[in-house]
């Protein structure tokens, strides 16, 4: 096709691809009608003057994953139609001034994964049509003022994975069309007030994996179109009360891996579009009332791996659309019976790895759509009667690694587990911790010959202990699941405790080590 070099493949669609370690210079002659040229995985170390002079129709040029360390200023002369230029994954340390001169049509410039030490305003001063500039994965330590001043049409700028320690508040001031700004994996310790003020069309701001300790109160106040804000893995210890106040379009906010100790009510919002909030790996110790009340559309709230020991009953007010709540690996000992009452659409709740000693009987009373509950590795000895009875969609319940007390009071839980087993995951079985003669034995195969109470007391109406989807109605209106009177009233009040008689001889039980936990 108009003379395709032997080291390359050329297609009818005017696409040329030259690959292989044997290539040490730009192959010639290149087809004059080439519109796309890819030079990949070669041993080319430098680009001399005008190697692409005769292919002026070129629109896309990818010179990636080579040994390229030096480029002559006139290397891209005569490529006035070029719209896409990638020099990514090479060994460039320096860009010659004027390298991109004459590339009047250039829209995408990829310089990522090189060894660039600095950029200067003159580098991009001719690239007035540039929309995308990728500089991530270099060795940049600072960005001089004016570096991007001529890139008024830029919509995407990636400066991630460099060595930036500070950002001038003026460096982005002319980028009014910028939609994506990525500064992740640098060494930024703070962002000056006003740094993002000119970015009125910004939709994504990635600041994760820096060393930011403090956020200025008005840092994001001009970014009304921001949709995704990544602040994870920094050193943020507190959030100024108004820092997120002007972000009505935000739908994703990550704050995990910081040093947050507390969250004040109203800190988030109003953010009517926020769908996910990631707060794990912080030092949060308590959640006050209404702390998330502005997040009406939140679907995922991740609060795991903190130090939460107290959750106010109204902490989750307003989260009517929440689907997933992760509270695992905290320091919870008790939960208020109403704490999840507002979470009518909750599907998955993770409470494992806490210190929960008991659960209120009405803890899941209004959360009828729950599909998964993780309660493993707590201090639970038993669960209230009927706690799961109304959860017709539950298909994963994890209860192992708790010190279950296998006396007669465990029978309702044991029966519930047995009668509902086809709907539950085949996870590790709950194992008895006490009394001593049943320790290590499976809760669902303990011997259940229960002694009769010596004094007959009329039974108090209890929570119905029915399996899911019973074939006949399981609880009449008189025993409503949300009835707090029933939750607090004892089920049976015998004068002597009934106990489960169990043989402690493992060989008689035929227990394997796996079964005995």
């Amino acid at each position: 096709y108009h003379g395709c070099p032997s080291e390359c493949t050329c297609s009818r669609a005017s696409q040329v691809e030259c690959t292989g370690a044997r290539i040490v210079a730009v192959p010639t002659p290149l087809p004059w009608n080439a519109m796309s040229l890819q030079i990949l995985n070669t041993h080319i170390t430098e680009l001399n003057e005008s190697p692409f002079l005769n292919i002026s129709a070129l629109i896309a040029l990818r010179i990636e994953k080579n040994e390229l360390s030096r480029i002559t200023p006139g290397a891209f002369r005569n490529l006035g139609s070029l719209r896409y230029l990638s020099l990514a994954n090479n060994k460039l340390q320096v860009l010659p001034i004027g390298l991109f001169q004459g590339l009047d049509s250039l829209e995408s410039l990829l310089l990522s994964s090189n060894q660039l030490l600095q950029i200067q305003p003159a580098h991009f001063s001719q690239c007035s049509n540039l929309k995308e500039l990728q500089l991530h994965g270099n060795h940049l330590e600072y960005i001089p003022d004016g570096a991007f001043d001529h890139l008024v049409g830029l919509t995407k700028l990636n400066l991630g994975k460099n060595s930036l320690t500070h950002i001038s508040p003026r460096v982005f001031q002319h980028l009014g069309n910028l939609q994506v700004l990525r500064l992740y994996e640098n060494r930024l310790t703070d962002i000056p007030m006003g740094t993002f003020d000119g970015l009125v069309n910004l939709q994504e701001l990635a600041l994760q994996q820096n060393q930011i300790g403090l956020l200025s109160p008005g840092l994001f106040h001009n970014n009304h179109n921001l949709q995704r804000l990544y602040l994870s893995n920094n050193h943020i210890s507190q959030l100024p009360p108004s820092v997120f106040m002007q972000l009505p379009q935000l739908n994703r906010l990550t704050l995990f891996g910081n040093s947050l100790k507390e969250l004040s009510p109203g800190i988030f919002g109003p953010m009517p579009n926020l769908r996910e909030l990631w707060l794990y790996d912080n030092h949060i110790s308590s959640l006050p009332d209404n702390v998330f009340s502005n997040l009406r559309q939140l679907q995922v709230l991740i609060l795991s791996r903190n130090q939460i020991s107290f959750i106010s009953p109204g902490a989750f007010n307003g989260l009517t659309e929440l689907r997933e709540l992760s509270l695992h690996t905290n320091a919870l000992q008790d939960l208020d019976g109403n704490v999840f009452r507002m979470l009518a659409n909750l599907q998955n709740i993770s409470l494992q790895n806490n210190r929960l000693r008991q659960l209120p009987g009405n803890i899941f009373a209004n959360v009828n759509g729950l599909m998964a509950i993780q309660l493993q590795n707590n201090q639970l000895e038993n669960l209230p009667l009927g706690i799961f009875d109304h959860l017709g969609k539950l298909c994963e319940l994890r209860l192992y690694d708790n010190p279950w007390r296998c006396d007669s009071d465990i029978l309702p839980l044991r029966n519930w587990l047995l009668l509902n087993q086809p709907r539950l995951g085949t996870d590790t079985v709950p194992v008895c911790f006490s009394p001593a003669n049943v320790r290590g034995q499976s809760l669902i195969i303990i011997n259940v010959n229960v002694a009769v109470p010596s004094v007959h007391v009329p039974e108090v109406p209890s929570y119905p202990e029915t399996p899911w989807y019973p074939d006949t109605p399981s609880y009449p209106d008189t025993t409503s699941v949300s009835s707090t009177t029933e939750l607090t009233s004892p089920v049976e009040d015998y004068t002597d405790l009934t106990t489960i008689q169990v043989t402690d001889d493992r060989s008689v039980w035929g227990m394997t080590q796996a079964q005995s936990g």
């Epitope: 029978l411 087993q421 499976s442 202990e465 399996p467 399981s474 009934t498 035929g510």
Partner: antibody, heavy 113, light 111 residues
Framework: QVQLQQSGPELVKPGASVKMSCKAS????????IHWVKQMPGQGLEWISY??????KYNERFRGRATLTSDKSSSTAYMELNSLTSEDSAVYYC????????WGQGTTLTVSS | DIVLTQSPASLAVSLGQRATISCRAS??????????MNWFQQKPGQPPKLLIY???NQGSGVPARFSGSGSGTDFSLNIHPMEEDDTAMYFC?????????FGGGTRLEIK
């Protein structure tokens, strides 16, 4: 000790209904499942249904013809069978707990015109 | 429904010897790492009696000569040593899922 005392034998006509009982003693009635099992003369065992605190599960083969109820005050479980045919002639057992650890002595039902 | 197939249909064993009855399920009866297979003994004119539950756990008051083993789909009941009193029908039963089903039975007698 745990006991399940079932009602006496029944002789009924085809198309009629019967209600048999199973009175539990020696344990807390509400803490255990009660199953009902059918055994035709000289044949195997067939699970019908269970009841636990008013919730029931049925074998599809008996749904609509068997109805389980219980009276907690007297620790008694009941099974009613309707639209009886000669195929329903059998011994009907009640049994306690998920694992059927104690059984009643059985109620013999004869359906004959 | 889970179908349980017992074998043999009848078995004669000498006193003091070992009797082995097998039960194969049409699908696994395991859950939570536990096999929900139970064994019952029934003598003429009497209700069944629970011998073994969850594959290998003895019912209350059941002599130690009765033992159960197996997992997944294949299970067995062992009686050793065989005694006169062990002449009866033996049924396996799965309680993994509704409808709970029984095997067809094995008649065990003294040789």
């Amino acid at each position: 000790q745990v006991q399940l005392q079932q009602s006496g034998p029944e002789l009924v006509k085809p198309g009629a209904s019967v209600k048999m009982s199973c009175k539990a003693s020696g344990y807390t009635f509400t803490s255990f499942v009660i199953h009902w099992v059918k055994q035709m003369p000289g044949q195997g065992l067939e699970w019908i249904s269970y009841i636990y605190n008013d919730g029931t599960k049925y074998n599809e083969r008996f749904r609509g013809r068997a109805t389980l109820t219980s009276d907690k005050s007297s620790s008694t479980a009941y099974m009613e069978l309707n639209s009886l045919t000669s195929e329903d002639s059998a011994v009907y057992y009640c049994a306690r707990d998920y694992y059927f650890d104690y059984w009643g002595q059985g109620t013999t039902l004869t359906v004959s015109s | 429904d889970i179908v349980l197939t017992q074998s043999p249909a009848s078995l004669a064993v000498s006193l003091g010897q070992r009797a082995t009855i097998s039960c194969r399920a049409s699908e696994s009866v395991d859950y939570y790492g536990i096999s929900f297979m139970n064994w019952f003994q029934q003598k003429p004119g009497q209700p069944p009696k629970l011998l073994i539950y969850a594959a290998s756990n003895q019912g209350s008051g059941v002599p130690a000569r009765f033992s159960g083993s197996g997992s997944g789909t294949d299970f067995s009941l062992n009686i050793h040593p065989m005694e006169e009193d062990d002449t009866a029908m033996y049924f396996c039963q799965q309680s993994k899922e509704v409808p709970y089903t029984f095997g067809g039975g094995t008649r065990l007698e003294i040789k």
